[in-house]
Interface confidence: medium
């Protein structure tokens, strides 16, 4: 028989981790593997039909994607949808496929909302998801004794899929649920330096453990301003939520990773500022199969998709699509063996959930909600060389933090700063001397109202739903 996979991904724009130029070669490799294995879908031919999730402008679209999905559904009656990856594109498609009872498999759609499988029934996420980042951050807080307060800053990028908005959403909700701590969150506009200064004054009043989701350049600028403002690593720690490790990518990712370095005359200060910085990324798979897969992926992309694939963590997404597709093929094979059909979406999906699988990305564990357990790395600066290296890995399956031998977290005072200052944020503890700004003076300098619409405390409601800003 014939089994049709309907692809709804960006076909023209190659900048997304789930662009077809990146995922296409991974699909080819997965299908070649299915064909080569007699135990997978024996007697079946798998074909792909392509549809774009982009608007005419070449960006992810919450209008184009569902229209494409409808066209593919009625024209080809696919057994499974692959993609979309973008949050705004995946949301309506996921609701349609749930209604049609057709499985949707993606390695994108990382937003918290897709975890609601009542709304997104039969949606399986074989890639990372932001709630899992919250698991990592919660484990980190437990390890370091931060159980009261955290602050999250995130950049608003107009006309975008709002990656930082959704990263923060997953982190915020999961950390709050896991630890029952206070998590404040502030949105800011990238590029507005005056605003950054105001932002850092708020930081002084609201946090010592700060998570920042922004571009590498913005993070560096904020670190420089923090140094200028006296927010040093003795009292503060700034985590850059740089999941794909863009700030760590030197030439081919092999040079010493110095995210503070720009050769712009500010490197000395930036180096000093980054003593207070740490970077959170996805963990690069370290199994030999992944390296071998990357080699094939890159060559296939170049020869058959006319696309030159760079090195980096972004390649874990095509790899996750590859593993997801093989997991799907396994689930269909099992469903058929038990008398089911390729259109039995519920049965196929259930066979993909709550199971482990050895893929090119290594050991892959799907949770009982159909979302992949995700591994993360924490990078810290070697004070000797200024190079960042992995000091801790988080194993999503075991929920354990694993230290990298020979590498320790670098704290200027030899220990992590407390998440709440000894005397409170406003020196409110009467036992302490009022040697910093008083509450009144601080409020005169800045209030939430002063920041106007640019700095908006996001509500839980916002974090649950996929609203454009």
């Amino acid at each position: 028989g014939n089994l049709t996979v309907a692809v709804v991904l960006p076909l023209a724009n190659t900048s997304y981790p789930w662009s077809w130029a990146r995922v296409g070669p991974a699909v080819e490799l997965a299908l070649a593997k299915v064909k080569a294995r007699p135990d997978l879908l024996p007697g079946w031919t798998v074909r792909t039909v392509l549809g774009s999730s982009e608007s005419a402008l070449g960006v992810c679209s919450d209008t184009a994607a569902p229209l494409t999905a409808v066209d593919l559904k009625w024209e080809h009656n696919p057994a499974v949808f692959l993609g979309p990856g973008c949050v705004y594109a995946a949301a309506p498609v996921g609701r349609f496929t749930a209604h049609w009872r057709v499985p949707l498999l993606t390695a994108g759609a990382p937003a918290l909302g897709f975890g609601a499988k009542d709304e997104y029934a039969l949606t399986t996420r074989a890639g990372p998801s932001h709630a899992k980042l919250g698991d990592f951050v919660a484990a980190l807080h437990r390890r370091l004794g931060w159980e009261r307060q955290a602050l999250v800053l995130y950049a608003y990028q107009p006309g975008d899929d709002q990656p930082c908005f959704f990263v923060v959403g997953g982190l915020y909700m999961r950390v709050r649920d896991r630890l029952n701590i206070t998590v404040d969150h502030l949105e800011f506009a990238e590029g507005d330096r005056d605003h950054y200064t105001l932002l850092l004054r708020t930081v002084r009043r609201k946090g010592r453990v700060i998570y920042i989701c922004s571009s590498p350049d913005t993070f560096r600028t904020l670190m420089l301003l923090a140094l200028e403002a006296g927010l040093s690593g003795e009292d503060y720690v700034f985590f850059h939520l740089d999941l794909f490790g863009h700030s760590l990518q030197g030439a081919h990712g092999l040079v010493p990773r110095r995210p503070w370095e720009r050769e712009d005359g500010q490197d000395v200060s930036a180096h000093q500022a980054f003593q207070a910085a740490k970077i959170i990324t996805y963990k690069e798979p370290d199994n030999p199969e992944y390296l071998e897969f990357l080699r094939k992926l890159k060559h296939l992309a170049r020869e058959q998709f006319n696309f030159t694939m760079e090195d980096g963590l972004v390649n874990t997404i095509p790899a996750a699509f590859h593993d997801g597709l093989l997991l799907y093929a396994q689930a269909v094979t099992e469903t058929l063996a038990h008398g089911g059909t390729v259109t039995d979406g519920e049965s196929i999906t259930q066979r993909m959930w709550n199971r482990s699988f050895q893929g090119v990305t290594g050991y892959l564990k799907m949770d009982s909600n159909g979302d992949r357990e995700t591994d993360f790395s924490l990078w810290d600066m070697d004070p000797e060389t200024g190079a960042f290296r992995v000091v801790l890995n988080f194993n999503g399956t075991s929920q354990e933090l694993v230290t990298v031998s020979g590498h320790t977290l670098n704290w200027p005072l030899g220990h992590p700063p407390p998440d709440v200052p000894r005397c409170g944020f406003d020196n409110e503890d009467p036992a302490c001397n009022q040697d910093h700004f008083s509450t009144l003076e601080e409020q005169k300098l800045i209030s939430e109202e002063d920041l106007g619409g640019e700095q908006k405390l996001i509500s839980e409601e916002d974090l649950h739903h996929h609203h454009h800003h």
């Epitope: 080819e28 490799l29 070649a32 030439a251 081919h252 990712g253 092999l254 040079v255 030999p288 390296l291 071998e292 990357l294 080699r295 094939k296 890159k298 060559h299 296939l300 170049r302 020869e303 058959q304 006319n306 030159t308 090195d311």
Partner: antibody, heavy 120, light 107 residues
Framework: EVQLVESGGGLVQPGGSLRLSCAAS????????MGWVRQAPGKGLEWVSS????????YYADPVKGRFTISRDNSKNTLYLQMNSLRAEDTAAYYC?????????????WGQGTLVTVSS | AIQMTQSPSSLSASVGDRVTITCRSS??????FGWYQQKPGKAPKLLIY???RLQSGVPSRFSGSGSGTDFTLTINNLQPEDFATYYC?????????FGPGTKVDIK
């Protein structure tokens, strides 16, 4: 059994042209990237050119760019190298090579080579 | 273009010896790298691909290691048929480039 048989080599004057052919058998020709590697007498190996299975992509080494053209005829399972404006330094044995992108095996099959001599 | 340097350019060894040849690339090439053996008058033969993967049919006394910029070919228990010239190749990016070769001859 995979076989690659080159032909078309010979003696040619500087500035002249030659067309090399490589007849392939024993594998799915269209699925493979094909290429040419040369070796000057007593010297090392030098990659010359490659072409993808779908004909869309061609690549050339700097010394031959603009003078050599790689092509293939998938219906005839044949690879070609059109060499124009030949120079003395193009004198070499030219090998036809395969590259299976699904396995990642680069240049795993080689022909026996055809000798091109550029001399006046 | 990426430059490949190979060392030594030649070496003399005896049957049963352990031989090590190294290759260095001018920039990081991950594991997009291979080793070839060529005997006089013959076409080269692929020994190792992806830096450390043994091509099928190649004896297990050949092994490859390395990633990034530094790569090694090791021949354990050198056999008479192993006396040949060995070339490394980067296929990380076009133009592909070979190393200058290492000639292994009988001591």
């Amino acid at each position: 059994e995979v076989q690659l048989v080159e032909s078309g080599g010979g003696l040619v004057q500087p500035g002249g042209s030659l067309r090399l052919s490589c007849a392939a058998s024993g594998f799915s020709f269209v699925s493979y990237v094909m290429g040419w590697v040369r070796q000057a007498p007593g010297k090392g190996l030098e990659w010359v050119s490659s072409i993808s299975g779908s004909l869309t992509n061609t690549y050339y080494a700097d010394p031959v760019k603009g003078r050599f053209t790689i092509s293939r005829d998938n219906s005839k399972n044949t690879l070609y190298l059109q060499m124009n404006s030949l120079r003395a330094e193009d004198t070499a044995a030219y090998y036809c090579v395969t590259y299976d992108i699904l396995t990642g095996h680069l240049f795993d099959y080689w022909g026996q080579g055809t000798l091109v001599t550029v001399s006046s | 273009a990426i430059q490949m340097t190979q060392s030594p350019s030649s070496l003399s060894a005896s049957v049963g010896d352990r031989v090590t040849i190294t290759c260095r690339s001018s920039q990081g090439i991950r594991n997009d790298f291979g080793w070839y053996q060529q005997k006089p008058g013959k076409a080269p033969k692929l020994l190792i691909y992806a830096a450390s993967r043994l091509q099928s049919g190649v004896p297990s006394r050949f092994s490859g290691s390395g990633s990034g910029t530094d790569f090694t070919l090791t021949i354990n228990n050198l056999q008479p048929e192993d006396f040949a010239t060995y070339y490394c190749l980067q296929d990380y990016t076009y133009p592909f480039t070979f190393g200058p070769g290492t000639k292994v001859d009988i001591k």
